[in-house]
């Protein structure tokens, strides 16, 4: 169902000293700036709904500009316990205390807050990102080293009056920016406690939050300029699938990848892509300003509604998955990467997908909802779309049940 | 400016293995993925395969499976092609280049000679 | 795989001439044809890409047509820092082939 409800206290329509307070671009992430101890530190950090942990970088590393120095804060106090994050590529590690912590381009509020200051990385910080730290916005369930370990936003809720919720408005550029662009480039917003109206057009659409760990949610139909994938909806959710702002493409199961890259490369046959273009390998170029936006299929998401039998859908235009490119030796033209991927841990909803919505993360009612974004890039001919209701049976089926590891089974 | 620089000219022993490097500079590093290239006189240039740097997914051309290994560090912007039970064969230049539309970048060409 | 054949080992040219390089692909390719230019002793430089578009740099003496199955890299005003062997390439699908390359000399 749209927002049509009376208001609740803390989430009145404008949040000015929050607008425009992300920087960054899809393929590096969007960050934004935060305080750390006393006397402040001032901190970059990426604003990411796929994890759980505040971590920022505590040591000299070459990719860093900065970092927290928690011998310089008075407030800092140490836990005394280490944490170790693995990525399938990558890792970090450091040690867990926790120190003053606010936004300033967010609520006028300071917490004391868990944080990681990390020690010791690989393949995590990228160089020319901007950023030096993650905020984890996620829940407790997949914070590390355990969920006993209090994610940033619970900190946050819990010690001030700030309402349990918080939207992103994330701004994809529809071209490349160079360095100095990016830094001087608004990347968009995070609202935290509230909905800004000024962000959005049209209405807002609720999905259920299937499980509190990730944000996960439950797909339960994928069309292709119209036409339905027809897959058992069971393929879309293998093994979830969630809403991630710290990914860049729009990831999908194996299955689902090669059927929608089928029926996305019988939509544009009008032009021959190399192979290594739907693998994101090789880019396309077209002379500048001539990009074919119009041979390349919209790509539509229905999500499960609030309501029993009742879906919505949401709608993506090739400006959000042909994601732009700066290379030198083709500089004269506008290349672009193909960036929807494959993956092996379900479907990712990242910022291809979340650069066309204003996507509002009600934890107080476990949901998630999804509006066309007033920032979105688009053509005079097509633009991005939340639309319902629509009809969808037996939608619970959709959702994937992951075998549990009953561990008192295992020997010890 | 882009630049990719291989690794000094390696002389092996037949049955040894060898690891040359490329090291990228100028770019964002995990943008673009690095393929590596064997050219032997009268032989032409031949694509052994290439890495993303951004997940280290791998993808060999079927001839040089068994032969070559791909891996990247980001920290140091490095990819590395590991060669192994070196034959004459193997002997040739060997080339790092850079994706972007086919291969717009060229590393500066790494001697492999094997040689008892 | 597909078969890049450049049926011409090498071509004779003057200085200030027009000569043409050409490359038959063994199945359709689309436009996703590169050309490189090598030098002995020298890594290949990047000529032309999508058979017609030319890299940054590149003079516009090099000029590259052809989609399908054909392909041909036209150098006019031959110069003498042209003198060097030519490759085709295609990148429209895995594994990445190339020509057997063209060697251009002087008359």
């Known amino acids: 169902e749209t927002d049509e409800e009376p208001e609740e206290p803390g989430r009145r329509g404008s949040f000015v000293e929050m607008v425009d307070n992300l920087r960054g671009k899809s393929g590096q992430g969007y960050y934004v700036e935060m305080t750390v101890g006393s006397p402040p530190q001032t901190l970059n950090i990426l604003v990411d709904t796929g994890s759980s942990n505040f971590a920022v970088g505590a040591a000299p590393h070459p990719f860093l500009h900065r970092y927290y120095q928690r011998q310089l804060s008075s407030t800092y106090r140490d836990l005394r316990k280490g944490v170790y994050v693995p990525y399938t590529q990558g890792k970090w590690e450091g040690e867990l205390g926790t120190d003053l912590v606010s936004i300033p381009h967010g609520p006028n509020v300071t917490v004391r807050a868990n944080i990681a200051a990390i020690t010791e990385s690989d393949k995590f910080f990228i160089n020319g990102s901007n950023w030096e730290g993650i905020l984890g916005l996620a829940y407790a369930e997949i914070a590390r080293p355990d969920d006993s370990l209090e994610p940033f936003f619970d900190s946050l809720v819990k010690q001030t009056h700030v309402p349990n919720l918080f939207s992103l408005q994330l701004c994809g550029a529809g071209f490349p920016l160079n360095q100095s662009e990016v830094l001087a480039s608004v990347g968009g917003s995070m609202i935290i406690g509230g909905i800004d109206h000024s962000l959005y057009t049209g209405s807002l659409w609720y999905t259920p939050i299937r499980r509190e760990w990730y944000y996960e949610v439950i797909i339960v139909r994928v069309e292709i300029n119209g036409q339905d994938l027809k897959m058992d909806c069971k393929e879309y959710n293998y093994d979830k699938s969630i809403v991630d702002s710290g990914t860049t493409n729009l990831r999908l199961p194996k299955k689902v990848f090669e059927a929608a890259v089928k029926s996305i490369k019988a939509a544009s046959s009008t032009e021959k892509f190399p192979d290594g273009f739907w693998l994101g390998e090789q880019l396309v170029c077209w002379q500048a300003g001539t990009t074919p936006w119009n041979i390349f299929p919209v790509i539509s998401l229905y999500l499960m509604g609030e309501v029993t039998n009742q879906s919505f859908r949401i709608t993506i235009l090739p400006q959000q998955y042909l994601r732009p490119v700066e290379d030198v030796a083709t500089s004269q033209d506008d290349c672009y990467k193909f960036a929807i991927s494959q993956s092996s841990t379900g479907t990712v909803m990242g910022a291809v997908i979340m650069e066309g919505f204003y996507v509002v993360f009600d934890r107080a009612r476990k949901r998630i909802g999804f509006a066309v974004s007033a920032c979105h890039v688009h053509d005079e001919f097509r633009t991005a779309a939340v639309e319902g209701p629509f009809v969808t049976l037996d939608m619970e089926d959709c959702g994937y049940n992951i075998p549990q590891t009953d561990e008192s089974t295992l020997m010890t | 400016e882009v630049q990719l620089q291989q690794s000094g000219p390696e002389l092996v022993k037949p049955g040894a293995s060898v690891k040359l490097s490329c090291k990228a500079s100028?770019?964002?590093?995990?943008n673009f993925w690095i393929h590596w290239l064997k050219q032997r006189p009268g032989q032409g240039l031949e694509w052994i395969g290439m890495i993303d740097p951004s997940d280290s997914y791998t993808k060999y051309n079927q001839k040089f499976k068994a032969k070559a290994t791909l891996t990247v560090d980001t920290s140091s912007s490095t990819t590395y092609m590991h060669l192994s039970s070196l034959t004459s064969e193997d002997s040739a230049v060997y080339y790092c280049?850079?994706?972007?539309?086919?291969?717009?970048?060229w590393g500066q060409r790494t001697l492999v000679t094997v040689s008892a | 795989d597909i078969q890049m054949t450049q049926s011409q080992k090498f071509m004779s040219t003057s200085i200030g001439d027009r000569v043409s390089v050409t490359c038959k692909a063994s199945q359709n390719v689309g436009t996703n044809v590169a050309w490189y230019q090598q030098k002995p002793g020298q890594s290949p430089k990047s000529l032309i890409y999508s058979a017609s578009h030319w890299y940054s740099g590149v003079p516009d003496r090099f000029t590259g047509s052809g989609s399908g199955t054909d392909f041909t890299l036209t150098i006019s005003n031959v110069q003498s820092e042209d003198l060097a062997e030519y490759f085709c390439?295609?990148?429209?699908?895995?594994?990445?082939?190339f020509g057997g390359g063209t060697k251009l000399e002087i008359k």
């Open positions: 280049a850079r994706s972007g539309v086919a291969f717009p970048y």
């Open positions: 100028g770019y964002t590093f995990t």
């Open positions: 390439q295609q990148y429209n699908s895995y594994p990445y082939t």
